[in-house]
């Protein structure tokens, strides 16, 4: 008789999940020689241990602590770039501006980027059919808890001027329910972080509005100011030109507004 299996509302575990995590770990250590001490088999074992045989709606940050310990990494605390709803441009930026880091430029972020995973209570199986959706099923699912844990730690590590890239094309440029709005903003340490500088990325070619005056940006400024952190905001009117100027800052066209 086939065993009853819980049907969740979200997509199932990404195919080749164990192989992908292990391969990404080895690739990361190949790309980052300073992380060559990491034992990727142990990393996978710790990752697996966080969610295998556990109810996928009952995952805690504690479950991920062994993985967090193995993935401990020092990034320059004053070179952190946070982002919300504009991941691709943030990653393009750190690819060019090599001394700055998004969460996905760290080992743990790189391992899990764009992947989905979950297990089942009391079996060692990975569920490739479906996984809990944050809204429709439960928030304490393996993926959401992972990103909450690593995002909190990443924000806590930040110092001096922290940058955040925000998507100016969205109705809520700053969204309190995003990982940035619900986790990272609240875990920046006022005794270490002097300023949060928001870069609002414009989508439209002819969009010359000052999106730093958007009500949601004002809301972000208010939250940050109440936490005794200074706030500043810049419009990035031409993201393509912005990236080009990061690549070639001496270009004559890069002195004007971007």
């Amino acid at each position: 008789v086939p065993r009853w299996r819980q049907q969740w509302s979200g997509p199932g575990t990404t195919k080749r999940f164990p192989e992908t995590v292990l391969a990404r770990c080895v690739k990361y250590t190949e790309i980052h020689p300073e992380m060559r001490h990491v034992d990727c088999q142990s990393v996978w074992d710790a990752f697996k241990g966080a969610f295998i045989s556990k109810h996928p709606c009952n995952i805690t940050e504690e479950d991920y602590q062994p993985l967090m310990k193995l993935g401990t990494q020092t990034v320059p605390c004053n070179k952190i770039l946070l982002w919300s709803r504009i991941k691709d441009l943030a990653h393009q930026f750190t690819q060019v501006q090599r001394d700055m880091f998004t969460l996905e430029d760290t080992l743990l972020g790189y391992l899990a980027d764009d992947l989905t995973w979950c297990g089942e209570f009391n079996t060692s199986k990975i569920n490739y059919q479906s996984c809990p959706d944050w809204r429709k099923d439960c928030s304490n699912n393996p993926v959401s808890v992972f990103w909450k844990t690593v995002s909190r730690r990443f924000a806590e590590a930040a110092c001096d001027v922290v940058h955040v890239m925000l998507n100016g094309s969205r109705s809520k440029i700053f969204d309190k329910n995003s990982t940035f709005g619900s986790v990272e903003v609240h875990n920046l340490q006022p005794e270490k972080v002097q300023t949060l500088e928001a870069w609002v990325i414009h989508g439209g070619r002819e969009d010359s509005r000052d999106l730093c005056q958007d009500p949601t940006i004002k809301e972000l400024e208010s939250i940050i100011s109440k936490r005794n952190i200074q706030f500043s905001c810049k419009n990035i009117y031409r993201p393509d030109k912005f990236l080009q100027c990061v690549k070639n800052p001496e270009d004559s066209s890069c002195t004007s507004e971007i």
Epitope: E19, A23, R24, K27, E30, I31, P33, R36, H91, Q95
Partner: antibody, heavy 120, light 107 residues
Framework: QVQLVQSGAEVKKPGASVKVSCKAS????????MHWVRQAPGQGLEWMGW????????DYAQKLQGRVTMTTDTSTSTAYMELRSLRSDDTAVYYC?????????????WGQGTLVTVSS | DIQMTQSPSTLSASVGDRVTITCRAS??????LAWYQQKPGKAPKLLIY???SLADGVPSRFSGSGSGTEFTLTISSLQPDDFATYYC?????????FGQGTKLEIK
């Protein structure tokens, strides 16, 4: 088995560009970093850079920065290396290479090489 | 960049000889070193990785030793197929760098 098959020999004029391809088979293309190495006639080996096929991230040797671009097409499991503003000292055999994950980070697999001749 | 210096640049030997090639790194590279064999018109072939581990399919007459800055490749009893050029390579740090090569020729 793992195979890296490169495109054929090229003859280019100084100032031109060349694009060498490297088609991978026998493994999951996105699971491994691809490196490029070149060897001028009668000379030693020179590492040029790497690309992560999964994300398109790259890192290039300082001396080639601005002239080299490495790309991949994951749908065909092919890596490309483009070199621009060619000079006579770019005449070399160009190799793609990858590690085996079980052999440290030495290059266990190599393409057969592509001879690029730069001559006016 | 880390400089890799190989010696000798040419080595004449006979079948059955024991030969040693040395590679020196300009800074500590721990055991992050590979040795390759290359024959004319062919791609290099990995012989040794992590300074002393034998790659798959490589005859046991090849061995590597050393760590830090001094490394050696030893062929215990030369075979006719072993006459080729040998390169060391460090993969401790980017940019990866190779030694200038040692050409092993028949005496």
């Amino acid at each position: 088995q793992v195979q890296l098959v490169q495109s054929g020999a090229e003859v280019k004029k100084p100032g031109a560009s060349v694009k060498v391809s490297c088609k991978a088979s026998g493994y999951t293309f996105t699971d491994y970093i691809m490196h490029w190495v070149r060897q001028a006639p009668g000379q030693g080996l020179e590492w040029m850079g790497w690309i992560d096929p999964e994300y398109g991230r790259t890192d290039y040797a300082q001396k080639l920065q601005g002239r080299v671009t490495m790309t991949t097409d994951t749908s065909t499991s092919t890596a490309y290396m483009e070199l621009r503003s060619l000079r006579s000292d770019d005449t070399a055999v160009y190799y793609c290479a990858r590690s085996a994950h079980t052999t440290g980070f030495g290059f266990a697999y190599w393409g057969q090489g592509t001879l690029v001749t730069v001559s006016s | 960049d880390i400089q890799m210096t190989q010696s000798p640049s040419t080595l004449s030997a006979s079948v059955g000889d024991r030969v040693t090639i040395t590679c020196r790194a300009s800074e500590d590279i721990y055991s992050n070193l590979a040795w390759y064999q290359q024959k004319p018109g062919k791609a290099p072939k990995l012989l040794i990785y992590d300074a002393n581990s034998l790659a798959d399919g490589v005859p046991s007459r090849f061995s590597g030793s050393g760590s830090g800055t001094e490394f050696t490749l030893t062929i215990s009893s030369l075979q006719p197929d072993d006459f080729a050029t040998y390169y060391c390579q460090q993969y401790n740090n980017y940019p990866y760098t190779f030694g200038q090569g040692t050409k092993l020729e028949i005496k």
